[in-house]
């Protein structure tokens, strides 16, 4: 019996369509597949950012694959052809690996890139990113922000820059149609007559950087002689009620009595008849049902009750 061999895929390359980190890996079928016309050839693709310990592995029948990468680092990928056992009357046959790499030639020293990049998606409506200029860069240095997410035809530049001393130090984004629950890619590059500026790349998902508005309409309701129900309403805006967690801070007679985290817009508090004053504040955060992470809102306005009779039916500011 002659040993069955198969060639690796041809023309394996990583293509950058200008989406700031979302790259295409593509290849052509191997040479000399004539013997296996009745056979569906598969490809095993492995890829990673250089420096990462683990490879991502994909098995596909296609001649391309797309994924997001960190363009601050290089990318390496390898691929080989798989002939399933049905084609070889025995065990699976693998070709040797075809390998390729991709990186953006870095301009400028690392210190020139923007520092302390910070992005917040306020109330799931308004995205604001801010940064500090690179270390030691001159005032003639300006930074430009570009962004892309799946659904945009091409990367877009920031519409509204925030400036300090004539330098761009932030961006207020325009509305971002259908932009959550997918990778959001940002590149901040720069220009200076004095020296080249290093570009920075960032990737995140918008639902994970949401800072909601604080809850509103805080009220007290007496439930029984020793229970008071604290209630509030979800913050105004597009975030549905099911997406909120709340943290409550309750002070009874100037002492912090309770800090609690709850999932709905009420909290029942045990009280004593000696209570003279009760105050509470609430803040909100997008919960695990709607995001992997989030930022606590500011605290709500304080709602207080003080006086003789805590048995009143409703205590409303």
């Amino acid at each position: 019996d002659t040993e069955i061999k198969v060639n690796p895929p041809q023309d394996f390359e990583i293509v950058d369509p200008g989406y700031l980190g979302y790259l295409y890996l593509q290849w052509q079928p191997p040479l000399s597949l004539d013997h296996f016309k009745e056979c569906t050839v598969e490809y095993e693709l492995k890829y990673r950012n250089i420096g990462s310990e683990t490879w991502k592995t994909i098995i596909t029948k296609n001649l391309h694959y797309k994924d997001g990468f960190d363009l601050n680092k290089g990318i390496e990928a390898k691929i080989h052809t798989l002939l399933p056992w049905q084609c070889t009357n025995g065990s699976e046959v693998q070709s040797s690996w075809a390998e390729t790499t991709y990186w953006i030639s870095p301009q400028g020293i690392p210190e020139t890139k923007v520092q302390d990049m910070d992005c917040v998606y306020y109330n799931w409506q308004y995205l604001l990113c801010s940064w500090k200029p690179g270390i030691g860069v001159l005032l003639d240095t300006n930074y430009n922000l570009f962004y892309w997410y799946e659904g945009l035809d091409h990367a877009l530049q920031c519409v509204d820059y925030i400036k300090a001393d004539g330098q761009n130090i932030g961006c207020r984004f325009p509305y971002l149609e259908a932009s959550d629950y997918k990778d959001f890619y940002i590149c901040v590059n720069g220009s200076s007559e004095n020296k080249p500026i290093r570009s920075s790349y960032f990737t995140f998902q918008l639902q994970n950087i949401v800072k909601p508005l604080p809850p509103v309409y805080l009220t007290f309701t007496r439930e029984s002689s020793c229970e008071i129900k604290l209630k509030w309403s979800i913050p105004l805006g597009p975030i549905p009620a099911r997406c909120f967690d709340y943290e409550i801070e309750i002070r009874e007679d100037d002492t912090t009595l309770v800090t609690a985290t709850v999932e709905n817009e009420t909290y029942t508090l045990k009280t004593t008849n000696e209570t003279r004053q009760l105050c509470f504040v609430v803040r909100s955060k997008v919960n695990i049902a709607c995001s992997d992470d989030g930022i606590w809102s500011e605290w709500s306005d304080k709602q207080c009750w003080e006086g003789e009779d805590l048995s009143k039916k409703t205590l409303l500011r």
Epitope: Y122, Y126, D160, K163, R172, P174, Y175
Partner: antibody, heavy 119, light 111 residues
Framework: QVQLQQPGAELVRPGASVKLSCKAS????????MNWVKQRPEQDLDWIGR????????DYNQNFKDKAILTVDKSSSTAYMQLSSLTSEDSAVYYC????????????WGQGTSVTVSS | DIVLTQSPASLAVSLGQRATISCRAS??????????MNWFQQKPGQPPKLLIY???RQGSGVPARFSGSGSGTDFSLNIHPMEEDDTAMYFC?????????FGGGTKLEIK
């Protein structure tokens, strides 16, 4: 609840100056631009300019460059517009109005301050 | 400066019918793939209220009967069905470039 509080009215002498205030509450003041708009009775709306509380950056309508000075006090979340060398042409309602960047329009307006210039 | 010309200057529409207000810009107000055109409603003694931003996106709490369309230099605001409460002045406004400018306004009344 977003609120922009403006005094109801100001009566000033010709040639004098007036400083109009706009106190913001219910949102993070520095995240939004503050615009000022003039409206004379039965006339068009005139955009005076905008200030970015985040960094103090200002854009003026050139028609108001020598008339209006925009400032903010971040500690009190208050925007100010000083109008100088007042004439009867400056009698109008002046609105402050919040906007998040140019693509979102101006989403919350104060009730306006009516400025009357009269001797 | 970008000049905005609104038409008609006044309009009377029967309850339940469609009102269409047009706004033409002296040059394109498109940039970055966005049309920087906004529409406001103003009632006597009140500040303007944002109805539509970026040509076609509804402002917060604006009823669905208000819609905007257009790109480049030609834009329109549609109100359908017309309700009693819609009697007001309507202004278009561009925010593509400084100075931001407003149209001359359209007075909408019930026929």
């Amino acid at each position: 609840q977003v609120q922009l509080q403006q005094p109801g009215a100001e009566l000033v002498r010709p040639g004098a100056s007036v400083k109009l205030s706009c106190k913001a509450s219910g949102y993070t003041f520095s995240n939004y631009l503050m615009n000022w708009v003039k409206q004379r009775p039965e006339q068009d709306l005139d955009w005076i300019g905008r200030i970015d509380p985040y960094d103090g950056d200002i854009d003026y309508n050139q028609n108001f460059k020598d008339k209006a000075i925009l400032t903010v006090d971040k500690s009190s979340s208050t925007a100010y517009m000083q109008l100088s060398s007042l004439t009867s042409e400056d009698s109008a309602v002046y609105y402050c109005a919040r906007g998040y960047g140019t693509a979102y329009g101006v989403d919350y307006w104060g009730q306006g301050t009516s400025v009357t210039v009269s001797s | 400066d970008i000049v905005l010309t609104q038409s008609p200057a006044s309009l009377a529409v029967s309850l339940g019918q469609r009102a269409t207000i047009s706004c033409r810009a002296s040059e394109s107000v498109d940039n970055y793939g966005i049309s920087f055109m906004n529409w406001f409603q103003q009632k006597p003694g009140q500040p303007p209220k944002l109805l539509i931003y970026a040509a076609s996106r509804q402002g917060s709490g604006v009823p669905a009967r208000f819609s905007g369309s257009g790109s480049g230099t030609d834009f329109s605001l549609n109100i359908h069905p017309m309700e009693e409460d819609d009697t007001a002045m309507y202004f278009c406004q561009q925010s593509k470039e400084v100075p931001w400018t407003f149209g001359g306004g359209t007075k909408l009344e019930i026929k």
